[in-house]
């Protein structure tokens, strides 16, 4: 019965495999919000090339809770959201700072998820005695993808399948822990 007080408006569902969010609205209790990154790509001269590798986009960090039915994660997870217009890597950070955007003429460059990581989260469920856990797929990095007007939509739909077939060996591997240890951890969280 007291669960409603514990659950708040900041609770959001982390999408399951193949579902990726638009940048979410501002959430309550976000700790490391809106850190803009340039995707780690090397700097290049802003106007000399239209090669997709020359462009970068913003990676925003959002802290949120994972929910599944009435269950909520014991701790929030940090989710990366790919956001904004893609621009030349050297120009983009300055352009953001000045509140200006560089827009490429011709093809559209979209900021989309590049790599994913799976994370195990402990869930607290009202009335539940069993220790619950859930795997969630989180965006690990973003990339600029060049989209022409002919295949704009299909390209965007296409990264759902890309997510369903992630490449192996991308996740950090936690050391093995017994289910009993998980149970103790969850019981302590109640």
């Amino acid at each position: 019965q007291g669960w409603q007080a514990f659950k708040n408006d900041a609770t959001e569902i982390i999408p399951e495999l193949g579902e990726y969010p638009e940048p979410p609205p501002e959430l309550e209790n976000n700790k490391t919000m809106n850190r803009a990154e340039n995707g780690g790509r090397p700097p290049h001269h802003p106007f000399e090339t239209k090669d997709v590798s020359e462009y970068s986009c913003r990676e925003l960090h959002f802290t949120r809770y994972v929910t599944d039915g009435p269950c909520r994660s014991a701790k929030p997870v940090t989710e990366l959201v790919c956001s904004g217009q893609c621009g030349p890597a050297r120009l983009l950070p300055n352009a953001i700072g000045r509140g200006k955007w560089w827009r490429p003429s011709g093809p559209d460059f979209r900021c989309i998820p590049d790599r994913y990581r799976a994370q195990r989260v402990q869930l607290l469920c009202p009335g539940g005695e069993a220790p619950r856990a859930r795997k969630v797929r989180l965006v690990a990095s973003c990339k600029c993808k060049r989209l022409t007007r002919f295949h704009n939509q299909s390209e965007l739909k296409d990264f759902g399948t890309e997510a369903a077939r992630p490449q192996k060996g991308r996740k950090p591997r936690p050391r093995a822990r017994s289910a009993k240890a998980n149970q103790a951890e969850l019981e302590n969280a109640y």
């Epitope: 399951e16 599944d68 039915g69 009435p70 539940g128 069993a130 856990a133 992630p166 093995a176």
Partner: antibody, heavy 118, light 107 residues
């Protein structure tokens, strides 16, 4: 598309052991929990246990402790169920399934029929 | 272990009818109940989770309700493809357990 492909039917002698496999395609097996469920002829479903292939964590139903052993090999994207000291009570269809959570079952394999002969 | 009792064992319906399946838990389990459909010679598939939460890809004629000890799965207009066995499963405590199932058949 998420799919779980189970190994073929097994006919085994009483007292022997059998090892069933469940190979995932369309996703990495370590990104899910893998559960095993038993269904005897004309009967309901019994949960055997789950394994987290990422790190080998397991949880067994008390009834199946000592009878069933769950393992996983992430390099081949495959989970295994070994059943030992087989009796006629172990004649059943065994399903593997992949779940986002360790407490309900999202995707099911097609099942493997195990027949124990005396 | 939590015992789940499903009733009736067999339900006979005509296409287009509304039908309800009952699942009763031996102790209060909140909304920690999930429903599965198993067609003849097929594998089970998840229909509803947490008593009432719909699953992507499952027709909207399937719905669930209940909390505590009494739960219901409903099909608001039965189609021939719905002829199957239906199982409830609890996730309130280990071990996870299933009901014995209800068989849906055509009149």
């Amino acid at each position: 598309e998420v799919q779980l492909q189970q190994s073929g039917a097994e006919l085994v002698r009483s007292g022997a052991s059998v090892k069933l496999s469940c190979t995932a395609s369309g996703f990495n097996i370590e990104d899910y929990y893998v559960h095993w469920v038993k269904q005897r002829p004309e009967q309901g479903l019994e949960w055997i246990g789950w394994i987290d292939p990422e790190n080998g964590d397991t949880e067994y139903a008390p009834k199946f402790q000592g009878k069933a052993t769950m393992t996983a090999d992430t390099s081949s994207n495959t989970a295994y169920l070994q059943l030992s000291s087989l009796t006629s009570e172990d004649t059943a269809v065994y399903y593997c399934n992949g779940g986002y959570g360790n407490f309900y079952f999202d995707y099911w394999g097609q099942g493997t029929t195990v027949t124990v002969s005396s | 272990d939590i015992l789940l009792t499903q009733s009736p064992a067999i339900l006979s319906v005509s296409p287009g009818e509304r039908v309800s399946f009952s699942c009763r838990a031996s102790q209060s389990i909140g909304t920690n109940i999930h429903w599965y459909q198993q067609r003849t010679d097929g594998s089970p598939r998840l229909l509803i989770k947490f008593a009432s939460e719909s699953i992507s890809g499952i027709p909207s004629r399937f719905s669930g309700s209940g909390s505590g000890t009494d739960f219901t799965l409903s099909i608001n207009s039965v189609e021939s493809e719905d002829i199957a066995d239906y199982y409830c499963q609890q996730s309130n405590s280990w071990p996870l357990t299933f009901g014995a199932g209800t068989k849906l058949e055509l009149k």
